[in-house]
């Protein structure tokens, strides 16, 4: 079948990195500068992606593969193949149409990307707040208020170390 196809379509013999040049009796011509073909039998070469502005070149274009971009410091990739770059913010902020804005009271963001999320509501799990939340950090939930009654320890002590053959005192 491949032989038949080759006889019918001379372009199928053109390897990656070339194109089937109709202007030259369907000779396989190398892709021109700044273009590539990643598969054989192509009638045109594709224009190489240019990594401009916020985009940095991660991998140069070759005759057989497109360039790959990533984002300059202060930005991160979004989308397939880093099709977009999105601005980083500081921890305790989120990106909006108006740029980076501080998280509202009661919310936090511990990353340079993403949105501010509400602090954990410790009481939903019957626990109390051990460490208050900030713009950058979630609250830390501790034992339930009932566990904090007089005489009760707020932190469970570690089990004493046991040596073989000895009972704990």
């Amino acid at each position: 079948f491949e032989r038949t196809r080759s006889l019918q379509d001379p372009c199928s013999n053109c390897p990656a990195g070339t194109f089937c040049d109709n202007n030259r009796n369907q000779i396989c011509s190398p892709c021109p500068p700044n273009s590539f073909s990643s598969a054989g039998g192509q009638r045109t070469c594709d224009i190489c992606r240019q990594c401009k502005g916020v985009f940095r070149t991660r991998k140069e274009c070759s005759s057989t593969s497109n360039a790959e971009c990533d984002c300059t410091p202060g930005f991160h990739c979004l989308g397939a193949g880093c099709s977009m770059c999105e601005q980083d913010c500081k921890q305790g902020q989120e990106l909006t149409k108006k740029g980076c804005k501080d998280c509202c009271f009661g919310t936090f963001n511990d990353q340079k990307r993403g949105i501010c999320r509400p602090w954990t509501n410790c009481s939903l799990d019957g626990k109390s707040v051990l460490v208050n939340g900030t713009k950058e950090r979630d609250v830390v939930c501790g034992p339930s208020p009932a566990d904090l009654s007089p005489g009760a320890s707020s932190v469970t002590p570690p089990a004493p170390a046991r040596e073989p053959g000895h009972s704990p005192q």
């Epitope: 502005g53 979004l78 099709s83 977009m84 770059c85 990106l95 149409k97």
Partner: nanobody
Framework: EVQLVESGGGLVQPGGSLRLSCGAS????????MFWFRQAPGKELEWVAN????????YYVDSVEGRFTISRDDAKNSLYLQMNSLRAEDTAIYYC????????????????WGQGTTVTVSS
């Protein structure tokens, strides 16, 4: 081919004005949020201003608020940045960029950038 080309940069004295232009081609300009970013020597790229599709929403970084004005002319497929009361710290390469498809609904990313135009503020 989708393309953005900036122009209008140059050398200007402190307190002076410049108007940057960005010509768009290869896409329906009126469908996209548009941006200006800048990169000062030795510093990270920073967002300067952005404008929504119909020009009704405009936002600026604090350091240029009241001095710079972003505008667009969809009939001319052009974005502008009017820069007044220029300061030495405004010296940078200024880039025009396009908001990616779905900008502000699902992300705040940009996908097409120009090559940049250089603004130097010096006496």
């Amino acid at each position: 081919e989708v393309q953005l080309v900036e122009s209008g940069g140059g050398l200007v004295q402190p307190g002076g004005s410049l108007r940057l232009s960005c010509g768009a081609s290869g896409f329906t300009f009126s469908n996209y949020w548009m941006f200006w970013f800048r990169q000062a020597p030795g510093k990270e790229l920073e967002w300067v201003a952005n404008v929504n599709q119909d020009g009704s929403e405009k936002y600026y970084v604090d350091s240029v608020e009241g001095r710079f004005t972003i505008s667009r002319d969809d009939a001319k497929n052009s974005l502008y940045l009017q820069m007044n009361s220029l300061r030495a710290e405004d010296t940078a390469i200024y880039y025009c960029a396009r908001g990616g498809e779905g900008y502000s609904d699902s992300h705040y990313g940009t996908d097409v950038w120009g090559q940049g135009t250089t603004v130097t503020v010096s006496s």
